[in-house]
């Protein structure tokens, strides 16, 4: 069997290794009905064509049936995410059948061989489902396949091969290598179930992308842009581990999809919402916080079926751990004028004050240059529910775009020590909450004093619901 190694560094080498020769025919796929949350409980093995185990194991024909499909393995033993997912499904759906698809013999191989085995595993699952369909009361519509990494594509094959249509497939960071750009019949795709939802947490546009970048479902959700997950940076990993490695970072980000799904099962009262957007940069600018025309959705188990949509890319920010929910805000700041700005690019900071809580000081991420005499849009998110927003404190500081500009700025300052202060003029801030869809306008506390120098504070109070000005038509509030 393969020796263990880090998924990123050596997976690249794996793709070019010669095919291992199988010396013995090994059993391939087992179906383990998890009858208990306990990890040490052995569960019950279902056997195709044998009805007795169904009765002995207490398989409920009318209930929902979840098939959990693991991915490539370096250890030949189930990782703890699987135990957490089984436990969460049992907690949320007490009567459901939870089946772990054990394809370890075919997954504990060179990555390329495991990929080549996905089709046969998918076929085995389809045959099991076809056999179950022969039983009274069993409905394919009640079947939910949940596949992690390589397992997501196995689920796709199963959905493709089964007679009829599976109710739902959830792809948890479907594997990228050897699937990126593949034909729809050779990877997970929207045709594989009535509803296919996907979480992408480890995608990279440079280097090796462990997770698939392209959208492959009806809805494809990219938490934190689908790449760098909070709490998974090398610093976080090194901080929490005696011997942190890049392997741990990869595992953390790739596996985050599973934990987001588990979170959606166990923290039903704290659902995370994702918003449709054409790309990550537009989302970072705060442009995409609309819930009109099904443009927003819960993520994970609570996602609403949107069969009409195909390859709808959705984005959200998350916390570093459970519960992952954050509260998104779009902020529109109209910068009326710059004064003595030179080459300096401003960085804004806001503190939000609400009826429930106040936020920390939050930097406004600049995706593009700040435009003067124009409305600039930003995305802000808080980890706590602030309630209704009451006021906003704004500050800014100059951040040079380059060392050259910094040198120019310093030289300018040294030659003109009495250079008049740099100022921005901001009269109001428009805010939209992603979660409530409420729009609010905040006006400067002192309408006569709307200029702000670096390091100084400007306070804004809520002055109206909605965004419309007095001379415009009456304000409208969008509902989710």
């Amino acid at each position: 069997s393969p020796t263990p190694f880090g998924p990123e560094g050596q997976l690249a080498d794996e793709l070019h290794k010669p095919k291992a020769i199988q010396t013995e025919v090994k059993p391939s796929v087992r179906f383990n009905l998890r009858t208990s949350k306990d990890p040490e409980h052995e569960g019950c093995y279902l056997s195709l064509g044998h009805s007795q185990p169904l009765e002995d194991c207490g398989f409920n024909m009318t209930a929902k049936t979840f098939f959990i499909i693991h991915g490539w393995t370096m250890s030949g033993i189930f990782e703890n995410w699987l135990h957490k997912l089984v436990s969460a499904l049992h907690t949320r759906e007490k009567d459901a059948n939870v089946v772990v698809v054990d394809w370890l013999p075919l997954a504990h191989q060179l990555y390329t061989d495991a990929v080549n085995n996905t089709r046969v595993v998918g076929h085995s699952i389809a045959r099991m489902l076809d056999w179950l369909q022969e039983k009274d009361d069993f409905s394919l519509g009640n079947v939910h396949l949940i596949g992690y990494s390589l397992g997501a594509h196995v689920a796709g094959y199963a959905g493709n091969f089964v007679k009829g249509t599976v109710g739902r497939i959830t792809g948890l960071d479907p594997a990228g290598p050897m699937f990126e750009g593949a034909d729809i019949h050779k990877r997970l795709s929207p045709d594989d179930a009535d509803f296919v939802d996907v979480l992408h947490t480890y995608t990279r546009s440079f280097g090796l992308s462990i997770g698939i970048q392209m959208p492959v479902g009806h809805i494809d959700i990219y938490p934190n842009g689908g790449d760098f997950q909070p709490g998974c940076g090398l610093n976080d990993v090194l901080g929490s581990m005696a011997y942190g490695t890049i392997t741990e970072v990869v595992k953390c980000e790739h596996e985050r999809a599973v934990h987001l799904f588990v979170d959606s099962l166990v923290n039903q009262d704290k659902p995370s919402f994702a918003f449709q957007c054409t790309d990550s940069n537009r989302f970072k600018k705060g442009i995409c916080l609309s819930c009109r025309k099904n443009r927003c959705n819960s993520i994970g188990y609570n996602a609403k079926k949107m069969r009409n949509k195909r390859n709808s890319k959705m984005y959200l920010k998350t916390r570093a751990g459970m519960p992952f929910r954050v509260y998104h805000y779009q902020m529109k700041i109209h910068v009326f004028s710059y004064k003595n700005m030179g080459e300096i690019e401003p960085t804004f900071y806001v503190t939000l004050y609400g009826t429930n809580a106040d936020s920390q000081t939050l930097p406004l991420e600049i995706v593009e240059r700040i435009e003067q005499n124009a409305t600039n849009t930003f995305l802000v998110y808080t980890e706590e529910d602030l309630g209704d927003l009451l006021k906003i404190q704004l500050t800014w500081e100059g951040a040079s775009q380059s060392w050259y500009n910094l040198w120019k700025e310093l030289r300018s300052y040294l030659s003109q020590p009495h250079n008049p202060g740099r100022e921005l003029n901001i009269r109001r801030i428009r805010v939209k909450s992603g979660e409530t869809q409420r729009k609010l306008t905040f006006c400067a506390e002192d309408p006569e004093n709307t200029s702000i120098s670096p390091g100084r504070e400007l306070w804004f109070r809520k002055c109206r619901d909605g965004w419309r000005m007095k001379n415009e038509t009456s304000p409208t509030v969008e509902l989710p």
Partner: antibody, heavy 120, light 107 residues
Framework: EVQLQQSGPELLKPGASVKISCKAS????????IHWVKQSHGKSLEWIGH????????NNNEKFKDKATLTVDKSSSTAYMELRSLTSEDSAIYYC?????????????WGQGTTLTVSS | DIQMTQTTSSLSASLGDRVTISCRAS??????LNWYQQKPDGTVKLLIS???KLHSGVPSRFSGSGSGTDYSLTISNLEREDFATYFC?????????FGSGTNLEIK
Amino acid sequence: EVQLQQSGPELLKPGASVKISCKASGYTFTDNTIHWVKQSHGKSLEWIGHINPYYGGTNNNEKFKDKATLTVDKSSSTAYMELRSLTSEDSAIYYCARKGIYYSSPFDYWGQGTTLTVSS
Amino acid sequence: DIQMTQTTSSLSASLGDRVTISCRASQDINNYLNWYQQKPDGTVKLLISYTSKLHSGVPSRFSGSGSGTDYSLTISNLEREDFATYFCQQGNTLPFTFGSGTNLEIK
């Protein structure tokens, strides 16, 4: 009743190899994994590696990668661990233990241990 | 590898006492902590899994608790057969690792 019966004590010379056995009974052999643990004299326990009897897949602790080879014979429900190029450092008690299918499953049943002495 | 530290290597107590044995992990192990008892004849038994779940047949005077990196095993009302060595083990990450053991002896 679940039982893991290990082979008897061994006294071997440096450079030799030894194969320790662990016969399982009282449960379905392929439904759990078999793990091997080393306890040097008066010391703690060290995980050597495991084998999944269902298909023979193994995973070793990097430290024992070149020392231990794990195999199973499904027909007799027996797991084996071969230790090669023995040195005095390999003198220890070796245990086999049963474990469920998850990382987190505990070692719920243990063999009685096999004492290995390596001496010239 | 995750280091498991049992700071107390030896502990003396009397029959009927209540004792607590601690175990610390070098990183968060998500409650995947198991406790084992080793008798002087070398026999090893599972006591507690997943921090606090009592294994079948283990007396209720044994209990486990903890979270994150700090865990403990408590034996209330010590009986003669409880004098043994106790090991903790993490099941969070490969390779699985054990604490160095705490030897509980009669005072």
